[in-house]
Structures are given as C-alpha cells and as structure tokens.
C-alpha cells in the first residue's frame, strides 16, 4: 500500500489564552529524513495555510519567526501548538504531512481537528 495515513484528534478546545495544541501522527511508508508539516484551516469551504515547517528527522520543527505555530517532533509524531486564537478562528485545522526526502515523495492529509475558541469574558471594572 502506497498511501500514508495521518491521524489527529477530532476536537480540541483552545485555552482561555487562545492556545490550542494537538498531536499529528503519520504512518510513514518509507524512511524519511526530511518532513514538511503544514496546518491548513478550512472554514466555509475556504482553505488557508496557517503555518508550515520543514524539519529533519531527529531535529526540532522550525516555523517562521512570525508564525502563530510552534511544534516539536518525536519519531512519526508532531506536537503542534497554535497561539493567538480568537473566537473567529474556530474551524477545522487539518494536518498535512509530506515526506520530502529521500525519494519517493509521500503525501498524507489528516481528517482535521475542529478547534473551538471562546473569547474570554472581559473582567468587570473593580471599584476600589
């Protein structure tokens, strides 16, 4: 079988600080040394790239400096954290994994993690 399976949780609730974390796990058909992980957001049939990182197996994921994502890798598992989320960012976050090197290339796309973000209630003014 030449298909690469990607697993991720169905639902995650962001913290009150707008941070959501989830694990993206892939069943690698080959011995990849270079992997690219992309997080896509699907909402109202529109798809946008949230962030992407390429890493060498055994090394840390490096997202761009201005990225809202951070992550760590362990074997065929990537722990992704998305920060700065607000209620309007609620949506389906899909993990896409590409085994870039060595050949052959493999693509795997998860079913998505529905991230729910609830904006915190503003603190009432205190009379002191």
């Amino acid at each position: 079988c030449k298909a690469m399976h990607v697993a991720q949780p169905a639902v995650v609730l962001a913290s009150s600080r707008g941070i959501a974390s989830f694990v993206c796990e892939y069943a690698s058909p080959g011995k990849a040394t270079e992997v690219r992980v992309t997080v896509l957001r699907q909402a109202d049939s529109q798809v946008t790239e949230v962030c992407a990182a390429t890493y060498m197996m055994g090394n840390e994921l490096t997202f761009l400096d201005d990225s809202i994502c951070t992550g760590t890798s362990s074997g065929n598992q990537v722990n992704l954290t998305i920060q700065g989320l607000r209620a309007m960012d609620t949506g389906l976050y899909i993990c896409k994994v590409e085994l870039m090197y060595p050949p052959p290339y493999y693509l795997g796309i998860g079913n998505g993690t529905q991230i729910y973000v609830i904006d915190p209630e503003p603190c009432p003014d205190s009379d002191f």
């Epitope: 030449k2 298909a3 896509l40 790239e49 896409k96 693509l107 796309i109």
Partner: antibody
Amino acid sequence: QVQLVESGGGVVQPGRSLRLSCAASGFTFSSYGIHWVRQAPGKGLEWVAVIWYDGRNKYYADSVKGRFTISRDNSKNTLYLQMNSLRAEDTAVYYCARAGNWGPFDYWGQGTLVTVSS
Amino acid sequence: EIVLTQSPDTLSLSPGERATLSCRASQSTNYLAWYQQKPGQAPRLLIYGASSRATGIPDRFSGSGSGTDFTLTISGLQPEDFAVYYCQQYGTSPWTFGQGTKVEIK
C-alpha cells in the same frame, strides 16, 4: 486571481537545448510545489518534474532524468525547465501546474509547444 | 509506480444521459483526482481526494471509490461536458495519470 503563463517553446533540433519558463501570479509562489506536465500530440498527460517550496527538493520522471533540470526563482515568481539532449519523443505541449493545498494540480498554464525535429 | 487504467477508452452518449467513467489503480491510494480536458485547452481539476469537488465545479460531477477502484459520474451530460477525462494519483512519486476516457456525442 491565480495565473500561470508558460513561454520558451519552439522548434529545436534533436540533441539541442531549450529553456521553458512559467511566470506565476496571484498567489504566494514559495508556498507551493510546481509541476511540469507534458502532452505529446494526440496523446495523454505525462508528468515530467516537480520542484517544492524553497527549491531544494526536486523529482523527475525516469524519461527525462539526467536531461532535464527544474528550477525556480521565488524572488521572481518564476519556474524553469532546462531541457538538454532533446529527442523527437520530447515533442509535446508543456504545461506548468500548481500543486494545490490538497495535493492535486489545481491551476494550469495554457501550455507551450516544444517541437523536436531535424 | 502506481499505474492507472481507465475504462472505457471512449464513451458515446447523448446529452442528458449519465456518464460513468472508471479508473483502476495498481496499488491502493487515497489521493485520486479527475481532470477534464477540451481540445486546445489545459486540463481542469474536477475532483480530488476521490470524491471532493474542486471550486466552481457543477454538482452533476461526482467522484466515488476508494483503495484501487474509482468512478467519475456525470449525471445529465451537458453539451460542454463532451471532452477527455483523466484520473491521476498524487499520493506518491512519480505522479501518474490514466490514459484518458473520451466522452463523445452519440
């Protein structure tokens, strides 16, 4: 809107070289892999090569390996295909195509015709 | 490499009829696309992931199947649907296409 425009095709003798270009606009070029696909007259589609993101990772069809070189200039939003040691069987319309977020080729150029003939 | 075999090679139908095109893969894949190509034009993406319609594609086009057997169905052929259709796998290199099915007017 997303646009891909190929150029550089023409008539060339066997054994000679040709360089195709594909100018991209309407999207963040460096965030996508771009493929070359060709179609011989009256025939089906044949994948030729792909170059990913920052240009470090490239893949080629066996039929062109060692003769064709794919490259990209992300600062110019342009893809290239350097074709050396051309053969009659390389005669085809060459398309550049973007690998969309889900993987398939979601946007294609209009194609440029390469004719290898003496 | 994954070899894709399409059938039939040619399908002769009348406008309004239903077209059923088949694509069989030599190995299992989740990542199958369908393209439409008209003479003198570039291919156009119709279906990806075996069953998801690409942006702007009419709902008379539907894809189904999994593993090694896939189907493209056009329910109620319109005059503009007469063209050549290709399946493609994009889950692993090399990227491969089927040989195409021509849907022609009967």
